[in-house]
Interface confidence: medium
């Protein structure tokens, strides 16, 4: 490595991410058929024309706007599954109840999902060594602009009644912090979005507690009532049941008791 | 006010189908159920099946699945019960109702009912 | 299917004094049990559930009890807009079953 080269806090770009993107474009494409006019290579200069040759620290939402016009996709707006640090079941659910989509379900997110990538500021190299953390180094990454952009235009396009899975074994079930809480709440539209409604997900198998009375519930409800949205909660005491039950209810361990 | 108003009275032909509709209006609750109750002349409840229109998830009685099929339009917030091959043991007035409960995919009581539609099934 | 057993089939009440409906289930139903009311000529109305929790704007005077196998409606004084025919439905295991129904009539 080059001494030249900025090291950076967090791990660099996921190993063969040029040919993981244009494989993932294709699968996509290929099984989507609505998407099947979108030409991956052109995704993928749009993609890269993103962060290449830019300061890894200073990536806005305008360097990813080419990529965002190339993968403008219509999803059912009152289908949307928003989920926050529980990414795995929300992917899962959707997985069983086809209708139903998460930000990954659509290309530019299932494009991304899981990867990493920077570039270097005046050289065309893709950094394999590190990339830029969040908290650590800069909030203005690729990776952290990419989502923020894709996150907020999910949001955006939201309407009716919008989900979101929530994890219950988390200190803060509901955290201010994440994509969810700093950018998709604040993006739904009041006059197109209804009801906010929050699927608490327990942990333990014992646990029987009312996780939509927990104080950060309890702020999201606040936050969404001052933007004119209603809010609704509901806990999962056994997500394992849920998926199970709601496409087969009347299997034997479906019946309500925990 | 929160309501569900249903389609009025038919009289059917034994061979034919029917289609009942229940119309939500001021539902707060997002992932609700709208089940299908009947009550055939002097006779008691019966559970048909429901429907939860946000999950599209639909769910029969053993006794009438393949006869009867439960759909949902969100845009208008309405929901169908169609049965089909209607014998004169399927004259009854039709339910439909809101389903609430602590679990967004099996229990539920119905909290909010329409006002019932009589289907006649008479040659 | 759970079969629910409402007994007695008909009861004879004055008003102002109390009345006791039973429901019984084939099989536990822990407490996820209902009542409804229903007049001549109306959709039923939720009375309570849970076996225990009385719906949104139903008067203190119903109360309902049990778990299990064991329920009870109780009407502690009867008032003339009570008498009606009484249903239990157990939402525990598919598919939902109601009781016949209790009929409380003027004595």
């Known amino acids: 490595v080059p001494r030249w080269r900025q090291q950076w806090s967090g791990p660099g770009t996921t190993k063969r991410f040029p040919e993981t993107v244009l494989a993932r474009c294709v699968k996509y494409t290929e099984i989507h058929p609505e998407m099947r006019h979108v030409d991956c290579q052109s995704v993928w200069d749009a993609f890269k024309g993103a962060f290449i040759s830019k300061h890894p620290c200073n990536i806005t939402e305008e360097d990813y706007q080419p990529l965002m016009k190339l993968g403008t996709q219509t999803v059912p707006c009152n289908k949307i599954l928003l989920w926050s640090r529980i990414k795995d079941l929300a992917h899962q659910f959707t997985q069983v109840q086809r209708d139903m989509f998460t930000l990954e379900d659509t290309l530019l997110g299932y494009l991304a999902d899981d990867l990493t990538w920077c570039g270097e500021f005046n050289t065309s190299k893709i950094n394999y060594q590190s990339c830029p953390d969040w908290r650590k180094d800069c909030s203005n990454n690729p990776v952290s602009v990419f989502w923020k952009t894709v996150s907020r235009r999910f949001a955006e396009a939201a309407c009716d009644v919008v989900h979101v899975m929530l994890n219950g074994s988390r200190s803060k079930i509901f955290d201010k912090n994440s994509t969810f809480g700093s950018v998709e709440v604040h993006n739904l539209q009041p006059e197109k979005v209804q009801t906010l409604e929050a699927w608490v997900i327990h942990g333990g198998r014992e646990d029987s507690r009312d996780l939509c009375q927990d104080p950060t519930i309890k702020e999201l409800e606040s936050i969404i009532s001052k933007r004119n949205i209603q809010f609704s909660c509901k806990n999962i005491y056994r997500p394992d049941k849920f998926l199970q039950c709601v496409k087969n209810p009347e299997d034997s361990s479906c019946t309500s008791e925990i | 006010q929160v309501q569900l108003v249903q389609s009025g009275a038919e009289v059917k032909k034994p061979g034919s189908s029917v289609k009942v509709s229940c119309k939500a209006s001021?539902?707060?609750?997002?992932?609700?159920?709208i089940g299908w109750v009947r009550q055939a002349p002097g006779q008691g409840l019966e559970w048909m099946g429901r429907i939860i229109p946000a999950l599209a998830a639909t769910h029969y009685a053993q006794k009438f699945q393949g006869r009867v099929t439960i759909t949902a339009d969100e845009s208008t917030s309405t929901a169908y019960m169609e049965l089909s091959s209607l014998r004169s043991e399927d004259t009854a007035v039709y339910y439909c109702a809101r389903g609430l409960g602590y679990y967004l995919y099996s229990s539920y009581y119905f909290d909010i009912w329409g006002q019932g539609t009589l289907v006649t099934v008479s040659s | 299917e759970i079969v629910m057993t409402q007994s007695p089939a008909t009861l004879s009440v004055s008003p102002g004094e109390r009345a006791t409906l039973s429901c019984r289930a084939s099989?536990?139903?822990?407490?996820?049990l209902a009542w409804y009311q229903q007049k001549p000529g109306q959709a039923p109305r939720l009375l309570i559930y849970?076996?225990?929790t009385r719906a949104t704007g139903i008067p203190a005077r119903f109360s309902g009890s049990g778990s299990g196998t064991e329920f009870t409606l109780t009407i502690s004084s009867l008032q003339s807009e009570d008498f009606a025919v009484y249903y239990c439905q157990q939402y525990n295991n598919w598919p939902w079953t109601f009781g016949q129904g209790t009929k409380v009539e003027i004595k």
């Open positions: 001021g539902l707060p609750d997002a992932t609700y159920a």
């Open positions: 849970g076996a225990s």
């Open positions: 099989q536990s139903v822990s407490s996820n």
